[in-house]
Amino acid sequence: GSTVPPMVNVTRSEASEGNITVTCRASSFYPRNIILTWRQDGVSLSHDTQQWGDVLPDGNGTYQTWVATRICRGEEQRFTCYMEHSGNHSTHPVPSGNSHHHHHHHH
């Protein structure tokens, strides 16, 4: 099939006092090969500080996955979700505290 670029969605949730969990979800993409990782100050976080979901079919012939990490509240601007798929790439910031969703569809 032809390439379908992912929809990327960054959310945040309270983790513990002073910390938040930020989750980057990529959905509705094809083929299934994708790089999704959190970057801190432009550098990819080490693997042991991130949690990844499996790349799973979403029922429409496309795929979905996610990556999450825990960060200190107030440090959000230093973190970006990096996505690379079929030769295209994009970076996605953590939404501010009053905006819990950040959607981008990449073509």
Epitope: Q40, D41, G42, V43, S44, L45, S46, T49, C72, R78, G87, H89, T91
Partner: antibody, heavy 121, light 108 residues
Framework: DVQLVESGGGLVQPGGSRKLSCAAS????????IHWVRQAPEKGLEWVAY????????YYADTVKGRFTISRDNPKNTLFLQMTSLRSEDTAMYYC??????????????WGQGTTLTVSS | QIVLTQSPAIMSASLGERVTMTCTAT???????LHWYQQKPGSSPKLWIY???NLASGVPARFSGSGSGTSYSLTIGSMEAEDAATYYC?????????FGTGTKVEIK
Amino acid sequence: DVQLVESGGGLVQPGGSRKLSCAASGFTFSTFGIHWVRQAPEKGLEWVAYISYDSRTIYYADTVKGRFTISRDNPKNTLFLQMTSLRSEDTAMYYCARWAYEGGVNYFDNWGQGTTLTVSS
Amino acid sequence: QIVLTQSPAIMSASLGERVTMTCTATSGVSSSYLHWYQQKPGSSPKLWIYSSSNLASGVPARFSGSGSGTSYSLTIGSMEAEDAATYYCHQFHRSPLTFGTGTKVEIK
């Protein structure tokens, strides 16, 4: 004024160990990632290691992985590079360099004057 | 790891001449994560061009940068004496971070 001052270089025998230090001043050390970069005599720049501001992310060049350890003491504004199993090819000027973040761009904005390490018998 | 090969290794240019050097990566690098540094003998490197094409503060407008994927270049529109230096490309798209092999620009 931002200042990075390296120390600890000198002459070491092959197989020996050495610990380099980088003393920082003039900025809030605990909010910046720092790198070690080296330059062999008459050669180019070689990235050695990186430690994020909170020490949660650490990376090494393949040439030093397993032999060098980067660490930092934020309360003392000091960066370290513990080097073991030293080889002649580790002979170089070692720089510490601050990793800036400005407007979504990250880059080396301040460098120390360097400390020279010579590995020779 | 991503290896960055710069060419030529050394070049001589006359004053006023247009100079172009290249940086070739073994795998694709996002332009956001590709910078150029200038280093003069006895001095630490200085950020020269960031994110492939943006001039750092204080860099003369005769410099420009371009490229994408595995091929990047730095151009000096009209060589001046103060431009004699070694230029390094640098990527942090993938860890380990790497510098290019360097291009030394001399005055002919």
